[in-house]
Structures are given as C-alpha cells and as structure tokens.
C-alpha cells in the first residue's frame, strides 16, 4: 500500500512539473516588433505606423497577434509595454523642410467592444535640426505597466515618420505579460 | 491507511511549495551593473565599456556571469534588457573638442559559438553643446525583450566615453529573465 | 484503497492549482502612478512630487501602498522600477525665466529604519528652449531592476516642476515585482 501511494505521489509531482511548466509558458504572451521600413508613410503630422516585422531578426511574437498594424491582446493580464523610436536625418536623405521639429511617439490602446482609442504613453522632444550639421539623430524610449484585456489593440503613432530610423535595433515596440488580473 | 495518505499528501504539498519556490528563484537570473568610472576609456568614437560593478551599491547579479566587460547568459530564456547612460560636461572639465556631439549607446549581443556581434538596441541624440552654457547633461534609456541563449554575451558600446556620468544612478545596464523558451 | 488515493491525488492537484494561482497573484505587487496636476509645486529647483493618482485612468496599485507622496513597498523582492516624465512649454503660458534649462528626474529610495534617501536612477537633459519657437517639449524615461525591502519608499524628484506635462500618458512612474529575494 505504502509503495503504491509513493508511486501516486511521484505521479502527482511529475504531472505537476509538466503542468506548472506548461501553464507558466502559456501564461506569458509577449511580442517584440521591429519597424518595416519599406512602407513608412510621409508627412509631419501624427500618423499610425502599420508596418512592423514580427518574425525576422529580433522580432518575435507568442500568444499575441499582429494584424493590420496593431498588436492584439489574446489573453487578459497586466503587461509591461515599451517602445523605442529613433529619428535621424542625413543631408543625403533629403533636405529638411523645417529645422524646428516635433519628434514624438504615442503608444495607444484601442478597444473594439467600445470603439475608442486612448494614449497610454507618450514621449519625445522638440528639436532644432539646423542645416549646419550634416547628421542628426534622436531616440525616444517609453515604458509602462498596463492592464490589457483580450481583444484590445496596441498601436504606435509618431510625428515626422519620414525621419524614422529603419534599423531593427532602433525603432521597435513590444510587450510581455507580467501577471494575471485578480 | 487514510492517516498515512494524508501525511503523504502533506509531504507532497510541502515538497511542492519548496520545489516551486526553489525552481521559481532558480529560473530567474538577473543583473544590474553600474559603471566603474576608474577605468573609462577616452576618445569620441564608439568604444566598448568593459568596467562595471556587479556587487556594490545598486549593482547585483544572480545566475548570470560578469566577465571581461561582458554580461554572460548562463540560462536560456527571454530577458528584458535595459540600459541608462548619462553624459555630462562642466566647463571646469576643460573645453570640448567639438560642440557638435553624437551621444549614443549600443546594446550588443555576441555569440561565442558563431563569433558574431549584433546590436540589439540603440539610442541617443546628436547634441549641440555650446560654450554659452557652463553645464551640459543628457541621458539615454533603452529597453527591450530578447531571446538569449546560454553563453551569449551582452555588452555596452558608447560614443564619447569621456563624457560619461560616473554615478551609479546615472550609467548602468541590466537584464532579468521573464520566461523560458518554449 | 486505490480509489481513495486517487481522490486524495485529485484533491492535491486541485488545491495546488488554487494555491499556485493564488500565491502567484499575491507574489506580484505592482503600481502605476500618474501625475496629479492639481498640486504641482512651482520653482525650478529639485522638488519631490507628492501628488499622484493611484486609482483613476491608467493609475493602479496592488500589494503596495501610496502614502504621503511615496510608493511604499509591502513585500520584499526584486522590482523593476520605471518613470516617464514629460516637460512642456507653450508661449501662451508666459515667458520662461531662462532659456537654459536643466530638466531632470531622480527616482529615490528612502529607508525608514535607517532614515536615509538614495537616488536609484536619474535622467534628463540640459535644454536651450529659445523664444524663436512657440512650443517646446521633452521627455525622460528611466528604468532599472532593484532589491526593495518591505517598508522602503520610492519617490520622484524633478527639476522645473512648473513645466511638467499633466497628462496621465506623459508623467508617471511605477513598479512591478519580478522575483523574490533568495
């Protein structure tokens, strides 16, 4: 009898190890999306960036969905969201139309159920990029901890998209689930 | 018999609490490394920063290794990586060689198996630090979520290292494991 | 006998699912606090910001306490701390006292047991906000991984508080627990 119970206990431990490992992995959605520079819109006003890579280089996604330029939440939870946006201009990449620039990023959340869009985080700077210098660069980083529900969508808006740095190490955003909602 | 089973159950619960707690702790490597200003290289070109503290003040490390100026991954996983780099100049430190500066940070990953180095994240700004002001300061923050394999190395490169702020609250980088690789 | 053991096993599994879920939730304190702009101090020197929302809009708190302008740790652990601080000025708000500004944030930790305050993270920039431009903006982001003990307090100090952007997506700070202390 005692031997049988020990076998049962081992089975409990074993199945639990599997279950814990499995549930832990399944409980942690994440995404790291990098800019797809082949289709960056022009303009200096705030525009939504819809072209991102999710499966090449550093870009990856798990238990979240990327669709129509938006990162879609599949699992309720508290997530850490972040974005890194780099702007750059070299004299060879076109002449600046103005030296006074507003270089901004807005991380927005859209709820499908109640069609509404809200800015979760913003960052940036006004810059004076004079023609006296042949190269200009500026990066913005924002991050924060937010409650996200399944079906909600995260998107990125920037000003002056024509100045975006197209490198995967420069312009990206992402999210990872930290914990469940109580 | 029933009493015996209950004792076994308690043992299962107890061992599980220990196991879960232990495995959870072991599964979460981290590091927060602060600049060691006694050995900052000079120059304005991009250089790798090799001197960091790992065990004093805010600096700490667990289940990762710091060696030869690089943060070495001991455990496969998805990690959140971050860096905060501060640059500063006071007129008492001497004149700047140029007023047009490129203040940059690059967080790089090196794989030993396939000797190659790749930039995971970059940030910074071009700055005009005019002689009209006696003090100049600028900070960069970058962060992102990356898959790291055991043996891979994380390092920090900056431009204008002679302008680095040597305080532990100013110039640091770190990582913490968020989840296993499926 | 065997049937009884299976029932016990099911009970172990069931209680463990509950226990694991419950302990996981309880083990993860967090806070995301957004600026309360009704009570921002004036001046250009470094001041502690004491008015933050913890329960409206994006602001939230769990298993941590907000009191007297400080975020109080209730549970020992390693936490990721972050802050995003935005400064802005429009010419309609009046002339700036000086065009040379030091826009800074300091994330500090205070220990009650040993009354002392230490800066964990700092960031910012010196800026030249010339009268030639009608609008100026600048954001700072800092983040890092720190060991916090129950009873320790996190607070935010900034320079030039009168220039703070009062939006909840602009000026905020937060923390979330990543792991226990060994």
């Amino acid at each position: 009898g005692s031997q049988h119970i020990r076998a049962e206990k081992a089975m409990v431990d074993g199945s639990w190890l599997d279950l814990a490992k499995r549930s832990k992995l399944e409980a942690q959605p994440f995404a790291h999306l990098t800019i797809n520079a082949t289709d960056i819109p022009s303009g200096s006003h705030k525009v939504s960036l819809s072209s991102w890579y999710h499966d090449r280089g550093w870009a990856k996604i798990s238990n979240m969905t990327f669709s129509n330029g938006k990162l879609i939440v599949n699992q309720d939870g508290f997530y850490y969201l972040y974005a890194n946006i780099c702007f750059r201009h070299h004299e060879t990449s076109g002449d600046l139309a103005t030296e006074y620039l507003q270089l901004m990023v807005y991380v927005t959340k859209t709820s499908i159920k109640i069609p509404s869009s809200h800015t979760l985080m913003k960052g940036g700077s006004t810059k004076y990029w004079s023609g006296n210098s042949e190269f200009h660069f500026y990066s913005i980083n924002v991050g924060g901890f937010f409650k996200l529900r399944s079906g909600e969508e995260i998107s990125i808006e920037v000003s002056n998209p024509s100045l975006l740095d197209p490198d995967q190490d420069a312009t990206y955003f992402g999210a990872f689930k930290v914990r469940d909602i109580d | 018999g029933s009493q015996h089973i209950r004792a076994e159950k308690a043992m299962v619960d107890g061992s599980w609490l220990d196991l879960a707690k232990r495995s959870k702790l072991e599964a979460q490597p981290f590091a927060h490394l602060t600049i060691n200003a006694t050995d900052i290289p000079s120059g304005s070109h991009k250089v790798s920063l090799s001197s960091w503290y790992h065990d004093r003040g805010w600096a700490k490390i667990s289940n990762m290794t710091f060696s030869n100026g690089k943060l070495i991954v001991n455990q496969d996983g998805f990690y959140y990586l971050y860096a905060n780099i501060c640059f500063r100049h006071h007129e008492t430190s001497g004149d700047l060689a140029t007023e047009y500066l490129q203040l940059m940070v690059y967080v790089t990953k090196t794989s030993i198996k396939i000797p190659s180095s790749h930039t995971l994240m970059k940030g910074g700004s071009t700055k005009y630090w005019s002689g009209n002001s006696e003090f100049h300061f600028y900070s960069i923050n970058v962060g992102g979520f990356f898959k790291l394999r055991s043996g891979e190395e994380i390092s920090i490169e900056v431009s204008n290292p002679s302008l680095l702020d040597p305080d532990q609250d100013a110039t640091y980088f770190g990582a913490f494991k968020v989840r296993d690789i499926d | 006998g065997s049937q009884h053991i299976r029932a016990e096993k099911a009970m172990v599994d069931g209680s463990w699912l509950d226990l694991a879920k419950r302990s996981k939730l309880e083990a993860q304190p967090f806070a995301h606090l957004t600026i309360n702009a009704t009570d921002i101090p004036s001046g250009s020197h470094k001041v502690s910001l004491s008015s933050w929302y913890h329960d409206r809009g994006w602001a939230k708190i769990s298993n941590m306490t907000f009191s007297n302008g400080k975020l109080i740790v209730n549970q020992d652990g390693f936490y990721y701390l972050y802050a995003n601080i935005c400064f802005r000025h429009h010419e309609t708000s009046g002339d700036l006292a000086t065009e040379y500004l030091q826009l800074m944030v300091y994330v500090t930790k205070t220990s009650i047991k040993i009354p002392s305050s230490h800066t964990l993270m700092k960031g910012g920039s010196t800026k030249y906000w010339s009268g030639n431009s009608e609008f100026h903006f600048y954001s700072i982001n800092v983040g890092g991984f720190f060991k916090l003990r129950s009873g320790e307090e996190i607070s935010i100090e900034v320079s030039n508080p009168s220039l703070l952007d009062p939006d909840q997506d602009a000026t905020y700070f937060g923390a979330f627990k990543v792991r226990d202390i060994d």
Epitope: S44, T92, G94, D95, L96, T98, E99, G131, S162, L163 | - | -
Partner: antibody, heavy 122, light 108 residues
Framework: EVQLLESGGGLVQPGGSLRLSCAAS????????MSWVRQAPGKGLEWVSG????????YYADSVKGRFTISRDNSKNTLYLQMNSLRAEDTAVYYC???????????????WGQGTLVTVSS | EIVLTQSPGTLSLSPGERATLSCRAS???????LAWYQQKPGQAPRLLIY???SRATGIPDRFSGSGSGTDFTLTISRLEPEDFAVFYC?????????FGQGTKVEIK
C-alpha cells in the same frame, strides 16, 4: 488661392549677375519651405535650390553651389535667388515652387509659379 | 544622386486608350517618395501624384500611380484629349531631389 509670381529674369552676359524674386500670396509664407526649379529650353526639369520656412537652412544643387544664393524675407512674403557668375548653361525658365509642408523633409513641388526666363548669352 | 530613367521617351496613343508610363530609379527610392507631374506646352508643371500613389487635390481618378523600390508606374486608364502632354517623375527620398527626363504622350 496660392499664388507665386516670379520676376527679375532677362538677358545677361556670361559672368554677370541677376536677382530673381518670387512674390507669394494665399498661404502663411513663413511656414513653408520654398525652392527654385529650372528648365532649359526644350529640356527637362532641374531642382536648383531650397530654403526652410524660417530661412535658417539653405540647400543647393552641385551645379550652382557657390554661385547662387537663396534667401527669403518673410515679412514681405518674398523668395529670392541671387545668381552670380552666370554661365550659358544657366539659361532656363526659373520656377518658384512651394513645398507642401506635410513632411519634415522637402518633398514634391506644389504649386508652381509661371516662371521667369533667364538668358545668359554674349 | 539618384538618376531617374523614364520610358518610353514618346508614347503615341489615341483618346480613350490606356497609357502606362515607367520611371526607373538607379537606386531604391526611400519610403516610396516619388511624385509625377504633367506639363503642357508653355505652362508650368502640375502635380498629379505624390508618395508614389496618392492623387493630388483635384486630379481625376483616371490618373493612378504605383510601385516601390526602383520601379514606379503612372497609369492613365482612359486618355482624354486634355491629357496629352509631357510627364515627369521626381524623387524626394534623397538629396538632391531629381527628375526623370520626361515621357511625351502624343496623339496618334
């Protein structure tokens, strides 16, 4: 309605100078970058020079660098092109053009003035 | 600098026909930053398309632009008598901004 009216063209000898003007109306002149584009008789279009809305930054084609100077007087809503050391190959219709202002880098040209003819000949 | 080559040099078509004009760049045009203009004899050029495919204000929908990278196309779905002119492409993705040599669309 946006209007651009060029003046100052004419016949000039090689090595000589000429100053073109462009009077702008119908928009907030100081908010927009402006350029000069030229077209040699029977030939294609060539961008010559550009200037930011504030006048703080100026840009030139290699073919005119060091010889031409673009400037603007925002109080008079007027764009200028000072042309020195003129050559026969500078003979063209010079158009004053507005940058659309919807991008941070100078972009397409819209609208165009009717142009003024510059002839460099001895 | 980026060299833009337009083809054909001349296109002879009848009203009602479809016109397809090509503009090829010597290197990739950043961000599809390419514009098309129409110029009639004795007149200044007029903007038709910007951003490779966006129609300018007041331009009829028979004019359409497409392409990316190094290959761009202007299509006039059904030629009207007033459409016969010279058409130029222009890139603004790098400095200096450059024009193609033009394609003349003439009545057959």
């Amino acid at each position: 309605e946006v209007q651009l009216l060029e003046s100052g063209g004419g016949l000039v000898q090689p090595g000589g100078s000429l100053r073109l003007s462009c009077a702008a109306s119908g928009f907030t002149f100081s908010s927009y970058a402006m350029s000069w584009v030229r077209q040699a008789p029977g030939k294609g279009l060539e961008w010559v020079s550009g200037i930011t809305g504030s006048g703080g930054s100026t840009y030139y084609a290699d073919s005119v660098k060091g010889r031409f100077t673009i400037s603007r007087d925002n109080s008079k809503n007027t764009l200028y092109l000072q042309m020195n050391s003129l050559r026969a190959e500078d003979t063209a219709v010079y158009y004053c053009v507005k940058d659309p202002g919807t991008t941070s880098i100078m972009s397409w040209f819209d609208p165009w003035g009717q142009g003024t003819l510059v002839t460099v000949s001895s | 600098e980026i060299v833009l080559t337009q083809s054909p040099g001349t296109l002879s078509l009848s009203p009602g026909e479809r016109a397809t004009l090509s503009c090829r760049a010597s290197q990739s045009v950043r961000g599809r930053y390419l514009a098309w203009y129409q110029q009639k004899p004795g007149q200044a050029p007029r903007l038709l398309i910007y951003g490779a495919s966006s129609r300018a204000t007041g331009i009829p929908d028979r004019f359409s632009g497409s392409g990316s990278g190094t290959d761009f196309t202007l299509t006039i779905s059904r030629l009207e008598p007033e459409d016969f002119a010279v058409f130029y492409c222009q890139q603004y993705g790098s400095s200096p901004r450059t024009f193609g040599q033009g394609t003349k669309v003439e009545i057959k």
